[in-house]
C-alpha cells in the first residue's frame, strides 16, 4: 500500500482521519448521555483509489474487479482499522453510570 | 440493527454477499499463481440504509452525522465482517507452495 | 474493576519536594473523556482540589497553588504523578487521587497516602 | 475563583428524619455548554468520599432513592427524606463548571 499521505488524487482527498464535531443533539443522544456535551468525532473518510491503504488481499482484489467491472463491483471504502475507547455518562433506569466505549472513535483509516 | 434481508430500498439492495467470478488473469495473479484458475470472490455490495447491519457504535454515529451533513459525511460503507480462508497453490523461486491467504474471501457482511 | 493507589514519602521536611504518585487500574488514560485528579485533606478539615490531568495530557492546577503544582502521567504504566516544591506544615494532608469524567464525576477514589511536614 | 458556601456545618438529624444540605455559588456555575456541573459527595469517618448526585439532581447508580439534588444557578439542595445510619459522614458539593471546587463540607450526624 502507499504511504497514507501519498494521495494520488491531490493532497487531503483520501483515505484518511477527519475530526466531525457533534452536539448529543446531532447524534440522537440527547435523552441518553449527560456528558460530554459535544464530541470531536474522529472517523475515516476520502477515496480509496488503486492499492491506496489496501488493508487485506480482499481490498486488492475488489480494486482489480472494480477497474474491470465498475459497475457491479464498488471500489473498495475507507473505514477505521482501529479505534480509540471512549466514555460516556449516561443515564440508566438505576441512576447516572460512566460506560466506556470501544468503538466509537476512528483511529487510523484503511482501505476495504 | 434491522435484520439482514429486511432491506429498506427493496429485496436485495442493501449490504449483503455477492459472489463475483474471476480469473488469474481479472485478478492480476496469472504470474505468481497455479491454481485455481478462477476463483469465486465472495464480497460485500449494497446500500447502507439507517441503521441496518450496523457494525458498532461508530457505524450509527455515522449514519446520525450523514443525515445531517451529507455532503461531509459519508454512508456508512458495506465491508467484511469476517472472512473465509483460501487456498492458493502458488509459484516460488523454489518451485510450487501451497499458501493459506485468511483474508481473500468475505464470510459476512455489516455497514461502518 | 477500577482501583487508585496512593503512594508518597510519609514525611518530609519544610522546604523540600513533595513526589506523589497514583497507580491505578481498571482503566486507561489512553480513554477519551477520561482523567485523573489529585485532592487532598488536612486532618478533621474539608476536600481541597489541587489539579487534573485529562486523557490528552491537558492540565487543570488550583490557582492558589499553581506556581508549586506540577501533574503529569505515564500512559502505558497506568500512573499519574504530582510534584509540589517548597512544602510546608500547612502541606501536612492526606492526599487522594481520584479517577474524573469530564468536569467532575469522581466515581473512584484512592485511599489516600498521609504525608506529614516537619518544620 | 468559585467560592462555595456549605450551610449548615452541623447537622444533627434523628434516625427517620430528612435533612437538607444547602450549597451556594460565589457565581453562576452554568458553564459555556449549558451543563451545570454540580455534584455531592459523602465522606463516611475513615473512607475516602463517594460521588452521590452528577450534574445537580442525577443519582449515581446505586445511590438509593432518598437522595435527591436540586437548584440552579448559584442555589443548590441535597435532601435526604428519611436519613438512615449508613447516611451519616460529611456531605460536600463540588462544583467543575469553572476552576474546581469542594464547598466546606457539613457533617450530617445523630441528634
Known amino acids: 500500500a502507499r504511504n497514507g499521505d501519498d494521495c494520488p488524487l491531490g493532497p487531503g482527498r483520501c483515505c484518511r482521519l477527519h475530526t466531525v464535531r457533534a452536539s448529543l443533539e446531532d447524534l440522537g443522544w440527547a435523552d441518553w448521555v449527560l456528558s460530554p456535551r459535544e464530541v470531536q468525532v474522529t472517523m475515516c473518510i476520502g477515496a480509496c483509489p488503486s492499492q491506496f491503504r489496501a488493508a487485506n488481499m480482499h481490498a486488492q482484489i475488489k480494486t482489480s474487479l472494480h477497474r474491470l467491472k465498475p459497475d457491479t463491483v464498488p471500489a473498495p471504502c475507507c473505514v477505521p482499522a482501529s479505534y480509540n475507547p471512549m466514555v460516556l455518562i449516561q443515564k440508566t433506569d438505576t441512576g447516572v453510570s460512566l460506560q466506556t466505549y470501544d468503538d466509537l472513535l476512528a483511529k487510523d483509516c484503511h482501505c476495504i | 440493527a434491522r435484520n439482514g434481508d429486511d432491506c429498506p430500498l427493496g429485496p436485495g439492495r442493501c449490504c449483503r454477499l455477492h459472489t463475483v467470478r474471476a480469473s488469474l488473469e481479472d485478478l492480476g495473479w496469472a504470474d505468481w499463481v497455479l491454481s485455481p484458475r478462477e476463483v469465486q470472490v465472495t464480497m460485500c455490495i449494497g446500500a447502507c440504509p439507517s441503521q441496518f447491519r450496523a457494525a458498532n457504535m461508530h457505524a450509527q454515529i455515522k449514519t446520525s452525522l450523514h443525515r445531517l451533513k451529507p455532503d461531509t459525511v459519508p454512508a456508512p460503507c458495506c465491508v467484511p465482517a469476517s472472512y473465509n480462508p483460501m487456498v492458493l497453490i502458488q509459484k516460488t523461486d523454489t518451485g510450487v507452495s501451497l499458501q493459506t491467504y485468511d483474508d481473500l474471501l468475505a464470510k459476512d457482511c455489516h455497514c461502518i | 474493576q477500577v482501583t487508585l493507589k496512593e503512594s508518597g514519602p510519609g514525611i518530609l521536611q519544610s522546604s523540600q519536594t513533595l513526589s506523589l504518585t497514583c497507580s491505578f487500574s481498571g482503566f486507561s488514560l489512553i480513554t477519551s473523556g477520561l482523567g485523573v485528579s489529585w485532592i487532598r485533606q488536612p486532618s478533621g478539615k474539608g476536600l481541597e482540589w489541587l489539579a487534573h490531568?485529562?486523557?490528552?495530557?491537558?492540565?487543570r492546577y488550583n490557582p492558589s497553588l499553581k506556581s508549586r503544582l506540577t501533574i503529569s502521567k505515564d500512559t502505558s504504566r497506568n500512573q499519574v504523578f504530582l510534584k509540589i516544591t517548597s512544602v510546608d506544615t500547612a502541606d501536612t494532608a492526606t492526599y487522594y487521587c481520584?479517577?474524573?469524567?469530564?468536569?467532575?464525576?469522581?466515581?473512584?477514589w484512592g485511599q489516600g497516602t498521609t504525608l506529614t511536614v516537619s518544620s | 475563583d468559585v467560592v462555595m458556601t456549605q450551610t449548615p456545618l452541623s447537622l444533627p438529624v434523628s434516625l427517620g428524619d430528612q435533612a437538607s444540605i444547602s450549597c451556594r455559588s460565589s457565581?453562576?456555575?452554568?458553564?459555556?455548554?449549558?451543563?451545570?456541573?454540580l455534584e455531592w459527595y459523602l465522606q463516611k469517618p475513615g473512607q475516602s468520599p463517594k460521588l452521590l448526585i452528577y450534574k445537580v439532581s442525577n443519582r449515581l447508580s446505586g445511590v438509593p432513592d432518598r437522595f435527591s439534588g436540586s437548584g440552579s444557578g448559584t442555589d443548590f439542595t441535597l435532601k435526604i427524606s428519611r436519613v438512615e445510619a449508613e447516611d451519616l459522614g460529611v456531605y460536600y458539593c463540588f462544583q467543575g463548571s469553572h476552576v474546581r471546587t469542594f464547598g466546606g463540607g457539613t457533617k450530617l450526624e445523630i441528634k
Open positions: 457565581q453562576s456555575i452554568v458553564h459555556s455548554n449549558g451543563n451545570t456541573n
Open positions: 490531568i485529562y486523557w490528552d495530557d491537558d492540565k
Open positions: 481520584a479517577r474524573g469524567g469530564y468536569d467532575g464525576y469522581y466515581d473512584y
